[in-house]
Amino acid sequence: HNTTVFQGVAGQSLQVSCPYDSMKHWGRRKAWCRQLGEKGPCQRVVSTHNLWLLSFLRRWNGSTAITDDTLGGTLTITLRNLQPHDAGLYQCQSLHGSEADTLRKVLVEVLADPLDHRDAGDLWFPGESESFEDAHVEHSISRSLLEGEIPFPPTS
C-alpha cells in the first residue's frame, strides 16, 4: 500500500477519506488505527457501529470520529481540534472476524496555524529518515467547528 498524506492545520478539523470497493468489503465493519512504529501493531482508535447496517452513524472516540458510506465505498475519519501529537501514521481498515485488511495507509501532518504566533517547534513533520515512497499528498482545507456544530460526546 502506498501512503497518502493528509495535511491539516493545528486547532482545526482534518477530514481523512479512504475509498474502497463497496462490494469487496460488503458487510464488513471498518476501523481507524494508529501505527505504533514502522513494524509495530496498529492500535485501534475508533471503529464503525457494531451493526454494519448502521455504519453511516458517526461514532466518536475523543476527538476522532468515523462514518462509513457503505454504498459509495468511502470511509471518512474526522480529527477534530487537530494537535501536534495527532501527527503520524494511521490505517483505514476493513474488519472480518478478528482480522483487518488495510484499505489505506495515511500519514497525518499537522501544520502550524498561520494566525497562531506561538512557537511551532513542536509541530511534527516526517524526518528525512522516514521515507514514504510514492506518497500522495491530499491537502485538507479545514476550519474550526462552530459552537453549534460540536457533536455530542460519546455516550458510552
Epitope: 462490494m23 469487496k24 458487510g27 472476524g97 478478528s98 482480522e99
Partner: antibody
Framework: EVQLVQSGAEVKKPGESLKISCKGS????????IAWVRQMPGKGLEWMGI????????RYSPSFQGQVTISADKSISTAYLQWSSLKASDTAMYFC????????????????WGQGTLVTVSS | DIQMTQSPSSVSASVGDRVTITCRAS??????LAWYQQKPGKAPKLLIY???SLQNGVPSRFSGSGSGTDFTLTISSLQPEDFATYFC?????????FGQGTKLEIK
C-alpha cells in the same frame, strides 16, 4: 439460482500439470470471494485459499502457498485451481465455495459450494 | 493456525432422538463459527453461521450455541435425512480451519 459448477474428474500421473475450474452463475461473480477446499479420501476439509474475482486479490493457506495457484477470469465467471507438478498426495476431492460476508457479525462463511472435482494422481 | 476439535468423532442415534455435537477452538474465536452438513459424495451445506444463526432453508430442528472456545450443534429431533457428517469451521482468522468431523449414524 446461485450455482457453482466444477469441471469433471481428472486422472493424472505424478509430475503432470492440471487446472480445474469452477464456474459461477445466478449471482454477480465479481462481488463475492471464492474459496478452494480440499478433502482427502475419508478425511476432513482443508481451506486452501481464496480469490476475489473483481480484482484477483488472492490469499493462500500457508500449507498450500507455493503448491497451487488460484486464479480467476471474471469475463467468464470462472475461478481456477492449478498445479504445475502433481504428486500422489494431491489425490483428493476439491471443492470451490462462495464466501459470503454476513453483516450480522462482519465475518465470512461458505454459503454455496460446487459439486466437487475428484483428482486422482497415480503412476 | 486455530485448531478445531470436534467430539464425538461418531455418534449413533435413532430417528426422533436429540443429538448434540461439540466443537472446541484452540483459542477464543468470539462467535465466528459455522456448522456444515455433508452427505457421502456431496458438497458440504451451510447450516449455522455466527455460532447460532440459522441459514435460510435449514429446518428449525438445527440450532447452534456457544462463544469463545466452546460451541455446540443440536438437532432437536433427528430425521432420516439428518444422518450425515457434520463439520464446524472457524471464521475468526485465516487460514480458515475445520473440525475433523462428526459422523452421525443410524443406531
Amino acid at each position: 439460482e446461485v450455482q457453482l459448477v466444477q469441471s469433471g474428474a481428472e486422472v493424472k500421473k505424478p509430475g503432470e500439470s492440471l487446472k480445474i475450474s469452477c464456474k459461477g452463475s445466478g449471482y454477480s461473480f465479481t462481488s463475492y470471494w471464492i474459496a478452494w477446499v480440499r478433502q482427502m479420501p475419508g478425511k476432513g476439509l482443508e481451506w486452501m485459499g481464496i480469490i476475489y474475482p473483481g480484482d484477483s486479490d488472492t490469499r493462500y493457506s500457508p500449507s498450500f502457498q507455493g503448491q497451487v495457484t488460484i486464479s480467476a477470469d471474471k469475463s467468464i465467471s470462472t475461478a481456477y485451481l492449478q498445479w504445475s507438478s502433481l504428486k500422489a498426495s494431491d489425490t483428493a476431492m476439491y471443492f470451490c465455495a462462495r464466501q459470503r460476508t454476513f453483516y450480522y457479525d462482519s465475518s465470512d462463511y461458505f454459503d454455496y459450494w460446487g459439486q466437487g472435482t475428484l483428482v486422482t494422481v497415480s503412476s | 493456525d486455530i485448531q478445531m476439535t470436534q467430539s464425538p468423532s461418531s455418534v449413533s442415534a435413532s430417528v426422533g432422538d436429540r443429538v448434540t455435537i461439540t466443537c472446541r477452538a484452540s483459542q477464543g474465536i468470539s462467535s465466528w463459527l459455522a456448522w456444515y452438513q455433508q452427505k457421502p459424495g456431496k458438497a458440504p451445506k451451510l447450516l449455522i453461521y455466527a455460532a447460532s444463526s440459522l441459514q435460510n432453508g435449514v429446518p428449525s430442528r438445527f440450532s447452534g450455541s456457544g462463544s469463545g472456545t466452546d460451541f455446540t450443534l443440536t438437532i432437536s429431533s433427528l430425521q432420516p435425512e439428518d444422518f450425515a457428517t457434520y463439520f464446524c469451521q472457524q471464521a475468526d482468522s485465516e487460514p480458515r480451519t475445520f473440525g475433523q468431523g462428526t459422523k452421525l449414524e443410524i443406531k
